[in-house]
């Protein structure tokens, strides 16, 4: 039997400078594309190698992005969220939620779609 899986949730402000190829990550989520059950939030699904986010090093796959330049990402359609990032300017401030898995007992399995990465 697997041990209990707990999560440590932390928030962080990440300031990125848009690089030659942009911010360098992919997102999933939105009111029309729920990636996590009962949660229409926006999550990072991919960090592009050598992109701005990868070079900064703080943004991780599985992170939930709460706001962009102070604008809340709640209740947005997926494409509206994408467009918000694309139009966010050169200096982009992200409020993100990291969800770190903490194991108690035997290691469990984290499946695809689990926001912890």
């Amino acid at each position: 039997m697997n041990g209990r899986v707990d999560y440590l949730v932390t928030e962080e402000e990440i300031n990125l400078t848009r690089g030659p190829s942009g911010l360098g990550f992919n997102i999933v989520g939105g009111t029309d594309q729920q990636y996590v059950s009962n949660d229409s939030g926006i999550y990072v699904s991919r960090i592009k190698e050598n992109g701005a986010a990868a070079l900064d090093g703080r943004l991780q796959e599985g992170d939930k992005i709460l706001s962009v330049n102070g604008q809340d990402l709640k209740n947005l359609l997926h494409q509206d969220a994408v467009d918000l990032f694309r139009n966010a300017g050169y200096a982009v401030s992200l409020r993100v939620q990291h969800r770190l898995q903490v194991q108690n007992g035997p290691i469990g399995h984290r499946g695809e779609g689990d926001p912890s990465g």
Epitope: G22, N26, V28, G51, R86, E112, G113
Partner: nanobody
Framework: EVQLVESGGGLVQAGGSLRLSCTAS????????MAWFRQAPGKEREFVAA??????YYADSVKGRFTISRDNAKNTVYLQMNSLKPEDTAVYYC?????????????????????WGQGTQVTVS
Amino acid sequence: EVQLVESGGGLVQAGGSLRLSCTASGRTFSTYTMAWFRQAPGKEREFVAAISWSGTYYADSVKGRFTISRDNAKNTVYLQMNSLKPEDTAVYYCTAVIGSTVDSYSPSDPLEYDYWGQGTQVTVS
């Protein structure tokens, strides 16, 4: 890890049709951006078509002849190929990435995608 399995290739006469299928693993298939590339012997890999959350994209060489579509309930993306020409002969590869890029999307750039299938041979005689 996303697994992609292509099927539907074969030998067809010029002017004929084929429908390629690509079935993907994973329970969040609807969030995947999917594409088809092809590679003919001695030639570079070439973009064919892509389907993202926001729409579909085609290479000029196949526009009006090929149609990309998806069935999220079946975790499958399709490439309907009509009016096939001998120059369409190639190995066709399915590719995918989870989510949508927040940057300008370049569907024909192989670096946009993380996962690749093994390919299916299409021969037009």
